[in-house]
Interface confidence: low
């Protein structure tokens, strides 16, 4: 992996802005065609801005214009946009124009959200992206291919970065059990710029809590943890960035029973009573001297399955009482 990165870095240093990528066949054809089609003043170049910003839900225009050495080229051409990385990234848009045609017929528009605004015959490959989502925040690369009597192609190497901004949205808020019979709360929010998260609740004031860095591959997600919920009541997570704020709450209710010692005594008493009952049943059956095997179940009797995980937790740990919660 490190070697690959080093190799890419070397390539990035060696190749000029906008890379002239040709096959051997293309190269020989170009040596023949350059004299006919090229003017010394013109060469391949691509003009793209370093970044375009737009809000999630809106549309954005990715500008891309180019110059080429093949004056009056009127043959078939293909316009392509890729995402992620040049040359190898997945295509998100592709259109083809027939010889002499100004109409670039769309062959690929990922999810129907990409539309060519520019006219490739007029050296303009500008693209409109509809209904932006945070996942569209990446780098895009324009490319043009000539495929008639001239075989040539050119692709922007640096590309244009589409920066998608979004008001915060809390995607998950939950209460989880933690060691030492306690509960912890987790709040995950998305937004760009990544939102600042704050917890507020009983005896908390306004706590920034432990904020985890955005997860790899999910750069717009931020998680804040409240390690120990010590009081019952409503805990509110607030996510805020320059575009807005969002709130969601969870409620913690613990059913406070008797003291620890009396709880243990009650449990032991209940277990002892059950043991006595079992012995009684066994004794009664033995007294009947029935030849059949004992009809005891393979697994001990269980109480009916609870709907709430927190109720199950409370069964497993009597001193860790149940909690209730709600999602955003």
């Amino acid at each position: 992996m490190e070697k690959s990165i080093w190799l890419l870095a070397c390539l990035a240093w060696v190749l000029p802005t906008g890379s002239f990528v040709r096959t051997k066949i293309d190269t020989t054809e170009n040596l023949l065609n350059t004299e006919v089609h090229s003017s010394p003043a013109q060469r391949w170049s691509m003009q793209v801005p370093p970044e375009v910003s737009a809000e999630a839900g809106d549309a954005a225009v990715l500008p891309c214009t180019f110059t080429h050495p093949h004056r009056h080229y009127d043959g078939p051409l293909t316009a392509i946009w890729r995402a992620g990385e040049p040359y190898a990234g997945p295509q998100v848009f592709r259109c083809a124009a027939a010889r002499g045609s100004e109409l670039c017929q769309t062959a690929l528009s990922l999810h129907g959200r990409f539309r060519l605004l520019g006219n490739p015959r007029r050296n303009d490959l500008s693209l409109r992206v509809e209904r932006l989502a945070l996942a569209d925040d990446r780098r895009y690369f324009c490319r043009v291919e000539f495929a008639g009597d001239v075989h040539d192609r050119y692709e922007s190497r640096h590309g244009v970065r589409l920066h998608v901004t979004a008001a915060p949205r809390i995607v998950n808020i939950s209460v989880l059990p933690s060691p030492a019979h306690a509960f912890r709360a987790l709040c995950t929010a998305e937004g760009e710029p990544p939102p600042a998260l704050a917890w507020s609740g009983p005896a908390l004031g306004n706590s920034l809590a432990a904020v985890r860095s955005p997860r790899e591959g999910h750069g717009h997600l931020v998680t804040a943890e409240l390690p120990a919920l010590t009081h019952d009541g409503r805990y509110t997570c607030t996510a805020a960035n320059s575009l807005g704020r969002s709130e969601a709450s969870v409620y913690l209710f613990r059913f406070h029973g008797a003291s620890g010692a009396s709880t243990v005594a009650l449990l032991l008493g209940a277990l002892g009573f059950k043991a006595l009952l079992l012995l009684g049943v066994l004794a009664a059956r033995a007294a009947r001297r029935r030849p059949e095997h004992l009809d005891t179940p393979d697994t001990p009797p269980r109480s009916q399955a609870q709907e709430s995980n927190y109720e199950n937790l409370s069964q497993m740990n009597p001193r860790s009482p149940p909690a209730t919660m709600c999602s955003p």
Epitope: H111, G112, R131, L134, R169, V171
Partner: antibody, heavy 121, light 104 residues
């Protein structure tokens, strides 16, 4: 409470144009959201046709691109569907629908009651 | 274009029964939405973003899934749940073919 109501002729002749109006009450179509047309064919299959955004820009289903146009009249808080060169397969119930976008995804949260259009030959 | 396939096309369920409707996508998607359409009415948003209940939807409905496989579950079917159910994928505006739920 936002409400959408479709109106227009229930019968359109083959090869003519279908024109429908969606009247929106309770929300200004210039304030936000995407304002869509969706149709449901007799076999119950649903097809998204296109939308007009709050800023007036459009997007259409590629399969209808050459025949469809969605416009609006902001003063009346209405948006319109025009489908040219109709064929019998365009017989359907047409719904105008509001689409909400929440930063990650979009979904249709308010639907009109629908209007049935039959294409006669 | 992403194709959404719903199964089964028709499902018959008894009152109180738990049922699951399936929606599979031809390629991976981030979210799925579900709509309910009762006879003679327009579709109604039931579940959005895979698992969130729309306003006024009873808690017996739930949704889950990821990637290419999504499901809608009704924990205890009631008579009023008889309807057609459609899954919907946002980024390419496609709908599934629907599942018709009949109550025995």
């Amino acid at each position: 409470d936002v409400q959408l109501q479709e109106s227009g002729p229930g019968l359109v002749k083959f090869s003519q144009s279908l024109s429908l109006t969606c009247s929106v009450t309770g929300y200004s179509i210039t304030s936000g959201y995407y304002w869509n047309w969706i149709r449901q064919f007799p076999g119950n299959k649903l097809e998204w046709m296109g939308y007009i955004r709050h800023d007036g820009s459009n997007n259409y289903n590629p399969s209808l691109k050459n025949r469809i146009s969605i416009t609006r009249d902001t003063s009346k808080n209405q948006f319109f569907l025009k489908l040219n060169s109709v064929i019998t397969e365009d017989t359907a119930t047409y719904y105008c629908v509001r689409e909400i976008y929440d930063g990650s995804s979009g979904y249709f949260d308010v639907w009109g009651t629908g209007t049935t259009v039959t294409v006669s030959s | 274009q992403i194709v959404l396939t719903q199964s089964p096309a028709i499902m018959s369920a008894s009152l109180g029964e738990e049922i699951t409707l399936i929606c599979s996508a031809s390629s991976s998607v981030s979210y799925m939405h579900w709509y309910q359409q009762k006879s003679g009415t327009s579709p109604k948003l039931l579940i959005y973003r895979t698992s969130n209940l729309a306003s006024g939807v009873p808690s017996r409905f739930s949704g889950s899934g990821s990637g290419t496989f999504y499901s809608l579950t009704i924990s205890s079917v009631e008579a009023e749940d008889a309807a057609d159910y459609y899954c919907h994928q946002w980024s390419s505006w496609t709908f599934g073919g629907g599942t018709q739920l009949e109550i025995k």
